[in-house]
C-alpha cells in the first residue's frame, strides 16, 4: 500500500528522474539512426532537406552551456510534439510508398508518445511550469509527390535524430550539475 | 575515404594559447558530432569535450571548462580547438574523432598533433 | 565521473592464442537494452582505432576474432585467435554519462 492519505510523496530524486528521461531519449535516438539508415539505403537522397513546417533546431535557441532544466525540457517536448504530428502525417501521406519501413515507423510514432509522455511527467515531478495546451495546428498539405514525401521523410527523420542528440547533450550536461 | 585530418606539431610556452585545426572529408561533417580527446604521457585518455557541427555550441568536460574552447567551420568542414593559459601538465597528443550522435564512441581519428609546453 | 579499471595491465601471450582483457566500472553503464562501452585498439604513435561499440558491436572493417561481452559493471573484450598485428594496447571507455572516460589500457606484448 501506498503512504498514509494526506502524507507527503516522497519527493523524486532530479538525478534520477532526469536519468531515466535522458535513457529513453538514447533509445528514441539509436531507432531514429536505424531508421534514417534504412530510409538512406532504400530510398538514398543526396544533400540536406528541409521541411518549412518542422522546428527550427534547438541548436540555435542558445549555447547549451547556458541553457537550465526548464527551458531544455519545454523546448524539447514542444520541438518533439512537431515531430510525432510529421511521423503521424507521413504515416498517413506516404502509407504505401515507405510500406517497407512501416513497422519501424510505428514503432518510432509510439516510442516518440511514451517519451512525450516521460518529458511532462518529470516537469510535474520537478514542479516545472506547465505548458497551456497547444493551439491546434494548421493540418499538413499532402507531399506533392512521391518523391516530395521521400525528401520529406529525410528531413523529419534527419531533424529528429539532431534533435534528440541535442536532448541528449543537454540533460547528460544538465545532469552532472544537479 | 573517411578521413580527418589534424594540424601539425606546436611548441609553446607557458601562459600561451595553441589553436589546432582537423579537417574532415569523405563524409557529411554535419551527420556526427567533433571531440576532442588528449593523450599526455603515462596518463589515461582524456574526453577534453565535442561539438555538433550543425551549431548549438559545444559541451565540455568540466576538467577543460573555461580553458578549451572548440569551434567548427561548416563550410570549411573542419573543427578547431583551442587550449589557452598553457601549463606544462598540457604537453600531449591531442586527437580529433567523429562521434556518433548521441552515444560518444569514436569511430573515426585524426592522426594527432602534438603540443609541446615548455619554457 | 565513472572510473574504469582494466585487467591486467600487461599480458604476453603467444600468436594463436585466445586473449581475455577486462573493464570493470565504479557504477553499472548498462541501462534498457544498452550498454554504454567501447574498445579501443592503439598502436606506438598511432591513434586509438574503435574495435567494438555499445559492448558488443563489431566496428566496421575489425575482423571477425574481436568481440565484446558483458552488462552492468563488468566487461571483456575477447581476441579469439592472437595475430602478429593484434599486439598493442586497447583501451575501454564509457558513454553512460558525461564525461566519457577510459581505463587506463592493457597493454598487449607477445610472449
Known amino acids: 500500500p501506498g503512504p498514509p492519505p494526506g502524507s507527503p510523496r516522497a519527493s523524486p530524486d532530479p538525478r534520477a528522474e532526469l536519468d531515466s528521461t535522458v535513457l529513453l531519449t538514447r533509445s528514441l535516438l539509436e531507432d531514429t539512426r536505424q531508421l534514417t539508415i534504412q530510409l538512406k539505403d532504400k530510398f538514398p537522397a543526396d544533400g540536406d532537406h528541409n521541411l518549412d513546417s518542422l522546428p527550427t533546431l534547438a541548436m540555435s535557441a542558445g549555447a547549451l552551456g547556458a541553457l537550465q532544466l526548464p527551458s531544455v525540457l519545454t523546448r524539447l517536448r514542444a520541438d518533439l510534439l512537431s515531430y510525432l504530428r510529421h511521423v503521424q502525417w507521413l504515416r498517413r501521406a506516404m502509407g504505401s510508398s515507405l510500406k517497407t519501413l512501416e513497422p519501424e515507423l510505428g514503432t518510432l510514432q509510439t516510442r516518440l508518445d511514451r517519451l512525450l509522455r516521460r518529458l511532462q511527467l518529470l516537469m510535474s515531478r520537478l514542479a516545472l511550469p506547465q505548458l497551456p495546451p497547444d493551439p491546434p495546428a494548421p493540418p499538413l498539405a499532402p507531399p506533392s509527390s512521391t518523391w516530395g514525401g521521400i525528401r520529406a521523410a529525410h528531413a523529419i527523420l534527419g531533424g529528429l535524430h539532431l534533435t534528440l542528440d541535442w536532448a541528449v547533450r543537454g540533460l547528460l550536461l544538465l545532469k552532472t550539475r544537479l | 575515404e573517411v578521413q580527418l585530418v589534424q594540424s601539425g606539431a606546436e611548441v609553446k610556452k607557458p601562459g600561451a594559447s595553441v589553436k589546432i585545426s582537423c579537417k574532415a572529408s569523405g563524409y557529411t561533417f554535419t551527420d556526427y558530432n567533433m571531440d576532442w580527446v588528449k593523450q599526455a604521457p603515462g596518463q589515461r585518455l582524456e574526453w577534453i569535450g565535442d561539438i555538433n557541427p550543425h551549431g548549438g555550441g559545444p559541451i565540455y568536460n568540466q576538467k577543460f571548462t573555461g580553458r578549451a574552447t572548440l569551434t567548427v567551420d561548416k563550410s570549411a568542414s573542419t573543427a578547431y580547438m583551442e587550449l589557452s593559459s598553457l601549463r606544462s601538465e598540457d604537453t600531449a597528443v591531442y586527437y580529433c574523432a567523429r562521434g556518433e550522435l548521441g552515444h560518444w564512441y569514436f569511430d573515426v581519428w585524426g592522426q594527432g598533433t602534438t603540443v609541446t609546453v615548455s619554457s | 565521473d565513472i572510473v574504469l579499471t582494466q585487467s591486467p595491465a600487461s599480458l604476453a601471450l603467444s600468436p594463436g592464442e585466445r586473449a581475455t582483457l577486462s573493464c570493470r566500472a565504479s557504477?553499472?553503464?548498462?541501462?534498457?537494452?544498452?550498454?554504454?562501452i567501447h574498445w579501443y585498439q592503439q598502436k606506438p604513435g598511432q591513434a586509438p582505432r574503435l574495435l567494438i561499440y555499445l559492448a558488443s558491436n563489431l566496428a566496421s572493417g575489425v575482423p571477425a576474432r574481436f568481440s565484446g561481452s558483458g552488462s552492468g559493471t563488468d566487461f571483456t573484450l575477447t581476441i579469439s585467435s592472437l595475430e602478429e598485428e593484434d599486439f598493442a594496447t586497447y583501451y575501454c571507455q564509457h558513454s553512460r554519462d558525461l564525461p566519457p572516460t577510459f581505463g587506463q589500457g592493457t597493454k598487449l606484448e607477445i610472449k
Open positions: 557504477k553499472s553503464v548498462s541501462t534498457s537494452g544498452y550498454s554504454y
